[in-house]
């Protein structure tokens, strides 16, 4: 066969679906690789072909579209499973071609088992809710296109293993789940089970997501530098190690980049001819407020280093702050035998 533009195995789209549930998988060519859509391709005389490689096999084989009850079918650029089976796991390829053109991409599909409490190896999306922020909603994800708008499915929501009924501040409202006032106690995994009829059969879609309650923008503040501060003086003798921690608190802010950096004499440490190392550690509170600590260290400090200006800077979407460390050369204590003894009239 003639050459085909092969986009390889698209591991970025590691698709996971639950066993014994419907799954609709769009060919990624039109979403991420080609500049035209399926309709344009189809009307230009291009054909979409599907095939797969079973798990732990090397052999590419055509997909069997002649299974009972049309268990696997293709509709436009979508591959349908009604429902999936565990051994559907493998690498799937969609190829778009005619006599003069060919393009293909493969992607992994994993069919996953779940237990009665919806626990599974499925990677869960995380939805962040602001603490004590008023009514916020989550929506049952990835259910579009499974049934027509004329079909009215039943939706049941669970927190962990428990059906959500008569919960204090969590109210199921069809495809949405409303949190009247989100609290830390609302952290956890929430599952919606969507049940709908199709051709005399009943199908279930299970979607689980993790809810994480985070700091509210109402309470967000610019970064706060706890250290260095005006109360601590770093007094050192030449030759000693100088260690200055910069500890900064950042309020949680959605999509904010938190930055901490040191300047020495107004310059980046890399631009100063001293042997300085900086180590960073990061910790998070329960509401994902962040504390970053950057420790600046100079193994053997010189008297020149003790005159330098050491400033810790911090920046978030809320603003920029800076604080200088007070660094001093230690005044050597008097040597008793000489200085003090002379004071007592010794000769």
């Amino acid at each position: 066969s003639e050459r085909c533009d092969d986009w390889g195995l698209d591991t970025m789209r590691q698709i996971q679906v639950f066993e014994d549930e419907p799954a609709r998988i769009k060919c990624p060519l039109f979403e991420h690789f080609l500049k035209f859509n399926y309709s344009t391709a189809h009307s230009a005389g291009l054909t979409l072909i599907w095939y797969w490689t079973r798990q732990d096999r090397d052999l590419e084989e055509p997909i069997n579209f002649r299974l009972p009850e049309n268990r696997i079918s293709k509709e436009k650029d979508v591959l349908w499973f009604r429902p999936t089976l565990l051994n559907d796991t493998g690498n799937y390829t969609c190829m778009l071609r005619n006599t003069t053109y060919c393009s293909k991409v493969a992607f992994p599909l994993e069919v996953v088992q779940k237990d009665s409490c919806f626990n599974s190896p499925m990677k869960l999306p995380v939805h962040k809710l602001y603490i004590e922020y008023g009514i916020q909603r989550i929506t049952c994800p990835n259910v579009d296109g499974y049934f027509p708008s004329s079909v009215k499915p039943t939706i049941t929501w669970y927190m962990g293993c428990y059906k959500i009924q008569n919960f204090n501040n969590v109210i199921p409202e069809g495809m949405n789940l409303s949190f009247l006032i989100a609290l830390i106690s609302n952290n956890g995994n929430y599952t919606c089970v969507v049940t709908y009829p199709e051709n005399g059969r009943t199908f279930h879609l299970t979607r689980t997501l993790t809810v994480k309650v985070v700091g509210s923008p109402k309470n967000a503040v610019p970064p706060v530098i706890h250290s260095p501060n005006d109360h601590v003086v770093y007094e050192k003798e030449p030759g000693e190690e100088l260690l200055i921690p910069c500890t900064v608190y950042f309020s949680f802010l959605m999509d904010s980049r938190n930055e901490v950096w040191w300047t020495i004499d107004g310059k980046k440490p890399d631009d100063i001819t001293i042997d300085v190392t900086i180590n960073e550690s990061i910790s998070h509170s329960r509401t994902e407020d962040e504390t970053r600590t950057q420790i600046l260290s100079i193994k053997k400090v010189t008297s020149e280093d003790l005159k330098r200006s050491y400033v810790c800077h911090a920046r978030s979407a809320k603003g920029e702050v800076a604080k200088a460390a007070k660094v001093k050369q230690k005044v050597p204590a008097p040597r008793y035998t000489v200085e003090l003894a002379c004071g007592f009239g010794a000769t």
Partner: antibody
Amino acid sequence: EVQLQQSGAELVKPGASVRLSCTSSGFNIKDYFMHWVKQRTEQGLEWVGRIDPEDGETQYAPNFQDKATITVDTSSNTVYLQLSSLTSEDTAVYYCFRPLYYGNSPWFAYWGQGTLVTVSP
Amino acid sequence: DIQMTQTTSSLSASLGDRVTISCRASQDISNYLNWYQQKPDGTVKLLIYYTSTLHSGVPSRFSGSGSGTDYSLTISNLEPEDIATYYCHQYSKFPPTFGSGTKLEIK
């Protein structure tokens, strides 16, 4: 509040010396390097030098090595700039200033009001 | 010494205008550049340090940018109190040096 109060204008004769003062308040002078700059009429700023009040160590721009002497009296929170062998070229406004942060910070945030030195026979 | 050149010695603009003042270094100064404002009465203020960091209390209409040898100070919406002379200052190499200043006047 950080304040730098400079001494009044000086009219001096060529060949003489002059000592300008800059008295600080609102901070501990020993924590910050103190600097001086020169500004001639309708011209830019020229860095003269600086002193570390902690130990009196000074550093000067090459052009001012033999012209300027910076000293400090920490008991009165005052920095001095002495200019010697004055010529008409030394006629200028001299500013003292303090950096934003401790030590050798290059961000010059707090400035005195300036002292005009006029060298005239 | 590093030479700092402010080619425009004076600039006339109308209130509300966006004004850009430029400064060129005789060699790469790695963003180690500050901007100062000197009012007609001689008062000097730090506006921006390290090319683009606004000093506290400075209005957000002031901004700085640049890299290598070319830097600029922008006032986005000129106000009457912005009438002053603006100086750039490099601290990349000793001794620190300043530009000759750009005097901003109202049309």
